[in-house]
């Protein structure tokens, strides 16, 4: 049979932040290209990136339809310039990657603090809302429409002339804490999903602190 | 002020589907809280269903969940409850709440504020 | 699932007394994810307390909340008669949330 020369990928990995999902493999092509197919456990194979010299293969426009099903998918090896070859046993060769589930598996973006404001001993900071790819009645949903409660904030805070931090945690977006009338403020917040097993947290969002150029309200 | 109203059928047969409606007013089902159902088995004490975000986002009682759906209908500012399979051990008085933030220790937390009266569901042919 | 025990099943109390309500937790409650509710015959629970400690709106005062991990107390400082009713502990921290047996405030 013609597939002499095509070897089956490997190391096949999921990559996924906020539910944009890019299946990666090895290895680069020589004289081979791929073709990638997903489905749930209960469904038909849908193919993706037909041929294609990457190897890489976005399947973000196939997870988000449900995010909580979970996926499998496959990457066929065919040589070059004859994609119709198969292997001794009748089909191309190809290798299964790991099974995926959006929901529990994505990891959660870096969190970005939208806004602070300062009245008297009481400081709100807000945590800006970020937008995913999953659609919702030909809208893009929030990683809060999505996530609901199972997604909680940590605040971590501490005065900008000590390093001793303090901590608050929230089921919005939103925190209120009460701090020293005068000091200035330095802060960062962390996305977390308790329940899950897994990619549970984010990175930490960029440090904000009180008092600098931006002033004391930033939008 | 919100109020909530359940409504559906009082009687349902064994094997069937219950299915029950909660309308909200006097505010916007997608003003940032979540929708719960409960329920109270006669004479006993209280049982969470599960909840719903305006966006479509659902948790359920994992003792439930293979029979429950629970979906919104922002245009009609209703949520409702549909459980597959009933026996007699479904029957219960079903009661709908929102789940609104209130400010606790730094952050925000949800609590159910506001409920339904209560509608009595009984399973029997 | 958590397992909230509430105690004791009934209290038998006069007006004017002081209430305490226990609820115990088969493992810990973050403080920002217990309430309390009050239900009377044929009505909806009332929500009296949230983050263990914190009144509801409209709330009167002799209701108070304490306590923390597994051990959580309501205490209703002076009975009034429309106090009598279920008292019931809630967690909203874990799912499935969970609900205690409830304690029934019965006139002496």
């Known amino acids: 049979s013609g597939t002499t020369n095509t070897v089956a990928a490997y190391n096949l990995t999921w990559k996924s932040t906020n539910f944009k999902t890019i299946l990666e493999w090895e290895p680069k092509p020589v004289n081979q290209v791929y073709t990638v197919q997903i489905s749930t456990k209960s469904g038909d194979w849908k193919s993706k990136c037909f041929y294609t010299t990457d190897t890489e293969c976005d399947l973000t426009d196939e997870i988000v339809k449900d995010v909580k099903q979970t996926y499998l998918a496959r990457v066929f090896s065919y040589p070059a310039g004859n994609v119709e070859s198969t292997g001794s046993a009748g089909e191309p060769l190809y290798e299964n990657s790991p099974e995926f589930t959006p929901y529990l598996e994505t990891n959660i973006g870096q969190p970005v603090i939208q806004k602070y404001e300062q009245g008297g001993t009481k400081l709100k900071v807000t945590v800006k809302d970020s937008f995913t790819l999953v659609r919702r009645n030909n809208t893009f949903l929030s990683l809060r429409d999505v996530f609901g409660k199972d997604l909680i904030y940590t605040l971590y805070y501490w005065k900008s002339s000590s390093s001793g931090k303090k901590t608050a945690k929230t089921n919005t977006n939103e925190f209120l804490i009460d701090v020293d009338k005068g000091e200035n403020y330095c802060f960062s917040v962390q996305a977390v999903i308790p329940s899950r097993t897994v990619n549970r947290k984010s990175t930490d969002s960029p440090v904000e602190c009180m008092g600098q150029e931006k002033g004391e309200f930033r939008e | 002020q919100v109020q909530l109203q359940e409504s559906g059928p009082g009687l349902v047969k064994p094997s069937q589907t219950l299915s029950l409606t909660c309308t909200v007013s006097g505010g916007s089902i997608s003003s940032g809280q979540y929708w719960s159902w409960i329920r109270q088995h006669p004479g006993k004490g209280l049982e969470w269903i599960g909840e719903?975000?305006?966006?479509?986002?659902?948790r359920y009682n994992p003792s439930l969940k293979s029979r429950v759906t629970i979906s919104v209908d922002t245009s009609k500012n209703q949520f409702s409850l549909k459980l597959s399979s009933v026996t007699a051990a479904d029957t219960a008085v079903y009661y709908c709440?929102?789940?609104?933030?209130?400010?606790?220790?730094?952050?925000?937390?949800?609590?159910?504020?506001?409920w339904g009266k209560g509608t009595t569901v009984t399973v029997s042919s | 699932e958590i397992v909230l025990t509430q105690s004791p099943g009934t209290l038998s109390l006069s007006p004017g007394e002081r209430a305490t309500l226990s609820c115990r937790a088969s493992?810990?409650?973050?403080?920002?994810?217990l309430a309390w509710y009050q239900q009377k015959p044929g009505q909806a629970p009332r929500l009296l307390i949230y983050g263990a400690s914190s009144r509801a709106t409209g709330i009167p005062d002799r209701f108070s909340g304490s306590g923390s991990g597994t051990d959580f107390t309501l205490t209703i400082s002076r009975l009034e008669p429309e106090d009598f009713a279920v008292y019931y502990c809630?967690?909203?921290?874990?799912?499935?949330?969970?609900f205690g047996g409830g304690t029934k405030v019965e006139i002496k």
């Open positions: 493992q810990s409650v973050s403080s920002s994810y």
């Open positions: 709440a929102r789940d609104t933030p209130y400010y606790y220790d730094g952050g925000y937390y949800y609590y159910m504020d506001v």
């Open positions: 719903i975000y305006y966006s479509g986002s659902t």
């Open positions: 809630q967690q909203v921290g874990v799912v499935p949330y969970t």
